[in-house]
Amino acid sequence: CDLPQTHSLGNRRALILLAQMRRISPFSCLKDRHDFEFPQEEFDDKQFQKAQAISVLHEMIQQTFNLFSTKDSSAALDETLLDEFYIELDQQLNDLESCVMQEVGVIESPLMYEDSILAVRKYFQRITLYLTEKKYSSCAWEVVRAEIMRSFSLSINLQKRLKSKE
């Protein structure tokens, strides 16, 4: 499956929107840094099938969408930027869903890569728990925004590696 050229442009736009969502100086939030235990092994160059990588990427973007579409995120972040962000993520999800269906078929894909998908879900659960514990403070959102920018960048790198292997 070939992801369209617009897909990588959308990735870049999503990263730019995340950067623009900054509300306060991150220098004041150092004490709130937290280890979310990003599931790096799911994004490393191990010899997994392309379909598995696409499933993991899809889950990553779906969970990002879920995280940023809560009422708490709407209250904390710029709504115009959030709306644009949702559009970009939605397009990413559509592209990846088309790919998943082409690669493995719709029935088997969710079950085949359950462990990888579960690792991504647990990662986002840790992020949500952190935000809850920090009472969705400005600094907590700043830390999470930085974390999502990093994980999003790693997702983009995985997509680039998939493309180069074609």
Epitope: L30, D32, R33, E142
Partner: antibody
Framework: EVQLVQSGAEVKKPGESLKISCKGS????????IGWVRQMPGKGLEWMGI????????AYSPSFQGQVTISADKSISTAYLQWSSLKASDTAMYYC??????????????WGQGTLVTVSS | DIQMTQSPSSLSASVGDRVTITCRAS??????LNWYQQKPGKAPKLLIY???SLQSGVPSRFSGSGSGTDFTLTISSLQPEDFATYYC?????????FGQGTKVEIK
Amino acid sequence: EVQLVQSGAEVKKPGESLKISCKGSGYSFTSYWIGWVRQMPGKGLEWMGIIDPSDSDTAYSPSFQGQVTISADKSISTAYLQWSSLKASDTAMYYCARHPGLNWAPDFDYWGQGTLVTVSS
Amino acid sequence: DIQMTQSPSSLSASVGDRVTITCRASQSINRFLNWYQQKPGKAPKLLIYAASSLQSGVPSRFSGSGSGTDFTLTISSLQPEDFATYYCQQAIDLPFTFGQGTKVEIK
């Protein structure tokens, strides 16, 4: 391979201006902050300030606020430290180092080789 | 600003010795503490971050512990290449501050 390469040694006279550089390579330059550290001859490490190259937001140690200016040009992956009027007491080795910002990763894991600044009449 | 105090300021030890350096913060810094090694004419090198996490490529004879205000760097068996100056640095708040350094010399 991650590298921070600093500009060469400088010999200046008191009152002169100076801008030294730190060029990053082998990583996404805007994903890390760049900090500057001073080490006077035979002395310890002193943190001067930091910049987020993604938007050039800066923070300074009170001891260096107003004495130096930190800047960055993300288009060429380079951070700068500058003085408008050097003093003899600015004679030191200056290091740049990268910092992961708010991400959970090792702080100041890569350092430049240092730039020796000598200010003498 | 948070003050960082290291002790001792210097120590003499032999190859194979167990060496302990302590660092005290003027207020709680949780576990936001880093340790660096510096050799003459060289840039500092990160050894330990977040109080006890060993930086990639650093020998396992180096270890860090502590939280709050009191921290320790331990070299379990001193090697010839370990003779250097060691600095702690708090990373919880700006301005970041370093300890004054501990010079480890050959006995």
